[in-house]
């Protein structure tokens, strides 16, 4: 079944390559294990960026060696990327899974376009 | 809903400064970036800069660059727009937006700049 | 920086259909571009009526659509009503900024 998920259209990172974004659910019903994904379009290829499950007033875990980080607030997840360099400048979509209890529920946003600058080499300093 | 509701009508005189509030209400302020557009008298939109309150990472047009601070107030959700050097072809009014999937628009602050 | 250009002006009859367009100097205009069309009425602030292409606002009228046509992107308006004689300028977003076209006047005729 769908679902609308909100987000927003663009947003910067920070000279550190780190870059956060809200993904927002219309939940149908009530759900206590949600997935959130995060995938990243490019030249019209999408690969998945991190992926974490939680449960409902808990906070998101992703994998260890993940570059990503959340919090989850009712129908919202914050969402931080870190280590981005301008290369993965692109199209970051968000995608959210009622897993449990049933109906499965899943909702992909329209993604959020981050923009990333690589930021200019520190001078020698004598 | 959504509302973005700027502060009144400010007076200046060439070279002081004007600072010009956009409180907003209905969503995630820290989730989507603030842009700031001026529309002096009988003219089109012209695009300031944005800011990004999360991280307060801000983007500001060449041409305001050096002359222009946004700052955020996440506490408040409210968004500042501060324009010094002001001259006489800096009136116009000034509005806060948020340009996105679905877009807003506050209601706007005229500044008059005369001596 | 890019130039983002609107026609300056465009005149429709009542109920009728028109199309206005937003085009880039750097190449075809993308859903990257997330193209927004914004209404400007005189004495009034702009109000928004699509986002991201063809993301219309809950107060856009059903008559509005928003589209990429010919490499642009297009506002059109079917069925055209007195009320919609207005300034429409859209704005295109390029990786880390907005720009404005400098607008369209429509011209309902009576």
């Known amino acids: 079944k769908a679902m609308h998920v909100a987000q927003p259209a663009v947003v910067l990172a920070n000279s550190r390559g780190t870059a956060s974004f809200v993904c927002e659910y219309a939940s149908p019903g009530k759900a206590t294990e949600v997935r959130v994904t995060v995938l990243r379009q490019a030249d019209s290829q999408v690969t998945e960026v991190c992926a974490a499950t939680y449960m409902m007033g808990n906070e998101l875990t992703f994998l260890d060696d993940s570059i990503c980080t959340g919090t989850s607030s009712g129908n919202q997840v914050n969402l931080t990327i870190q280590g981005l360099r301008a290369m993965d400048t692109g199209l970051y979509i968000c995608k959210v899974e009622l897993m449990y209890p049933p109906p499965y529920y899943m909702g992909i946003g329209n993604g959020t376009q981050i923009y990333v600058i690589d930021p200019e080499p520190c001078p020698d300093s004598d | 809903q959504v509302q973005l509701v700027e502060s009144g009508a400010e007076v200046k005189k060439p070279g002081a400064s004007v600072k010009v509030s956009c409180k907003a209400s209905g969503y995630s302020f820290t989730g989507y970036t603030m842009n700031w557009v001026r529309q002096a008298p009988g003219q089109g939109l012209e695009w300031i800069g944005l800011?990004?309150?999360?991280?307060?990472?801000?983007n500001y047009a060449q041409k305001f660059q050096g002359r222009v601070t946004f700052t955020v107030d996440t506490s408040i959700s409210t968004a500042y727009m501060e324009l010094s050097r002001l001259r006489s072809d800096d009136t116009g009014v000034y509005f806060c937006?948020?340009?996105?999937?679905?877009?807003?628009w506050g209601q706007g602050t005229l500044v008059t700049v005369s001596a | 920086q890019a130039v983002v250009t609107q026609e300056p002006s465009l005149t429709v009859s009542p109920g009728g259909t028109v199309t206005l367009t937003c085009g880039s100097s750097?190449?075809?205009?993308?859903?990257?571009?997330?193209p927004n069309w914004v209404q400007q009425k005189p004495g009034q602030a702009p109000r928004s009526l699509i986002g991201g292409t063809n993301n219309k606002a809950s107060w856009t009228p059903a008559r509005f659509s928003g589209s990429l046509l010919g490499g642009k992107a297009a506002l059109t308006i079917s069925g055209a009503q007195p009320e919609d004689e207005a300034e429409y300028y859209c704005a295109l977003w390029y990786s880390n900024h907005w720009v404005f076209g400098g607008g369209t006047k429509l011209t309902v005729l009576r």
């Open positions: 800011i990004n309150p999360y991280n307060n990472i801000t």
């Open positions: 937006a948020r340009l996105d999937y679905r877009s807003y």
């Open positions: 750097t190449g075809a205009v993308t859903t990257s571009n997330f």
